[in-house]
């Protein structure tokens, strides 16, 4: 099996942006890797975003994705934007070594992302 490491806690910025590193220990020489960010709330797991990349190439999420990222070796730097207080929760990094076979799955323990909505600016007279 494949070990995936990610930070336990991250605090989103006042602009609703959270970044964290997802690192995996590859048991083989994969050329195609898929990275997925999952959100776990209670026992429900939903997909936040996903990207497949070829080793040595850049990580590309879909245009409408709330995620961006860069990759370097077995390390992926993930950024999630547009977060609100209601999005506070556990975000799991899932890594799949897709090609060549065999397939390997790696699931991190999750990063608890805390999002605090900024206080509205007081009206000035």
């Amino acid at each position: 099996a494949m070990h995936v490491a990610q930070p336990a806690v991250v605090l989103a910025s006042s602009r609703g942006i959270a970044s964290f590193v997802c690192e995996y220990a590859s048991p083989g020489k994969a050329t195609e890797v898929r990275v997925t960010v999952l959100r776990q709330a209670d026992s429900q797991v939903t997909e936040v975003c996903a990207a497949t990349y070829m080793m040595g190439n850049e990580l590309t999420f879909l245009d409408d994705s709330i995620c961006t990222g860069t990759s370097s070796g077995n390390q992926v730097n993930l950024t999630i934007q547009g977060l609100r207080a209601m999005d506070t929760g556990l975000y799991i990094c899932k890594v799949e070594l897709m090609y060549p076979p065999p397939y390997y799955l790696g699931i991190g323990n999750g990063t608890q992302i805390y999002v605090i909505d900024p206080e509205p600016c007081p009206d000035s007279d």
Partner: antibody, heavy 118, light 108 residues
Framework: QVQLVESGGGVVQPGRSLRLSCAAS????????MHWVRQAPGKGLEWVAA????????YFADSVKGRFTITRDNSKNTLYLQMNSLRAEDTAVYYC???????????WGQGTLVTVSS | EIVLTQSPGTLSLSPGERATLSCRAS???????LAWYQQKPGQAPRLLIY???SRATGIPDRFSGSGSGTDFTLTISRLEPEDFAVYYC?????????FGQGTKVEIK
């Protein structure tokens, strides 16, 4: 709710072909890996094949490699298993199963019986 | 290929008794990638436990899973009549995905 419905099973002679289908509903089909698992009469579960997301990544058990092909049509929310050069030992109930976000097989179809006999 | 060996092959117990099923892997399996399924005659398998110890949606708390490395256990604390079935463990951390040969829990 998630539903998987297999079809296409039947009786076929050794050496012939058969195509199984699995119609999926109740979830975003393209976001999940899909599997075929079979069970010979009175025996245990045997994983057969898997196909990922856009269909470009496929994996097969050694027992079917070179004979079976797995495909998916995301526009039709349907999974397929093309079985060629069938043998008596391929006789089994074939289930399709969804690979959940965390990897386990969280939903299964009711199965379709394939009997290979002359 | 990771080979999973389940024991015992058959477990004969009475309703209300505790059932302990074992699954041993030929090489280390992270607990994140070990599942248990229940199958009744003529039915498809049903997910009980994933990640070695997390109960699937709708599964009663009399079912629990534990273990790590190469040794995993499914425990049914008090057998109900509907629990008599065949149970399979599975690893899903790498291909090929593999299942144990199953343990049949039958009424004594």
């Amino acid at each position: 709710q998630v539903q998987l419905v297999e079809s296409g099973g039947g009786v076929v002679q050794p050496g012939r072909s058969l195509r199984l289908s699995c119609a999926a509903s109740g979830f975003t089909f393209r976001s999940f890996g899909m599997h075929w698992v079979r069970q010979a009469p009175g025996k245990g579960l045997e994983w057969v094949a898997a196909v990922w997301y856009d269909g470009s990544n496929k994996y097969f058990a050694d027992s079917v490699k070179g004979r079976f092909t797995i495909t998916r049509d995301n526009s039709k929310n349907t999974l397929y298993l093309q079985m060629n050069s069938l043998r008596a030992e391929d006789t089994a109930v074939y289930y399709c199963a969804r690979g959940g976000h965390l990897g386990h097989f969280d939903y299964w179809g009711q199965g379709t019986l394939v009997t290979v006999s002359s | 290929e990771i080979v999973l060996t389940q024991s015992p092959g058959t477990l004969s117990l009475s309703p209300g008794e505790r059932a302990t099923l074992s699954c041993r892997a030929s090489q280390s399996v992270s607990s994140s990638y070990l599942a248990w399924y229940q199958q009744k005659p003529g039915q498809a398998p049903r997910l009980l436990i994933y990640g070695a110890s997390s109960r699937a949606t709708g599964i009663p708390d009399r079912f629990s899973g534990s273990g790590s490395g190469t040794d995993f256990t499914l425990t049914i604390s008090r057998l109900e009549p509907e629990d008599f079935a065949v149970y399979y463990c599975q690893q899903y951390g790498s291909s090929p995905w593999t299942f144990g040969q199953g343990t049949k829990v039958e009424i004594k």
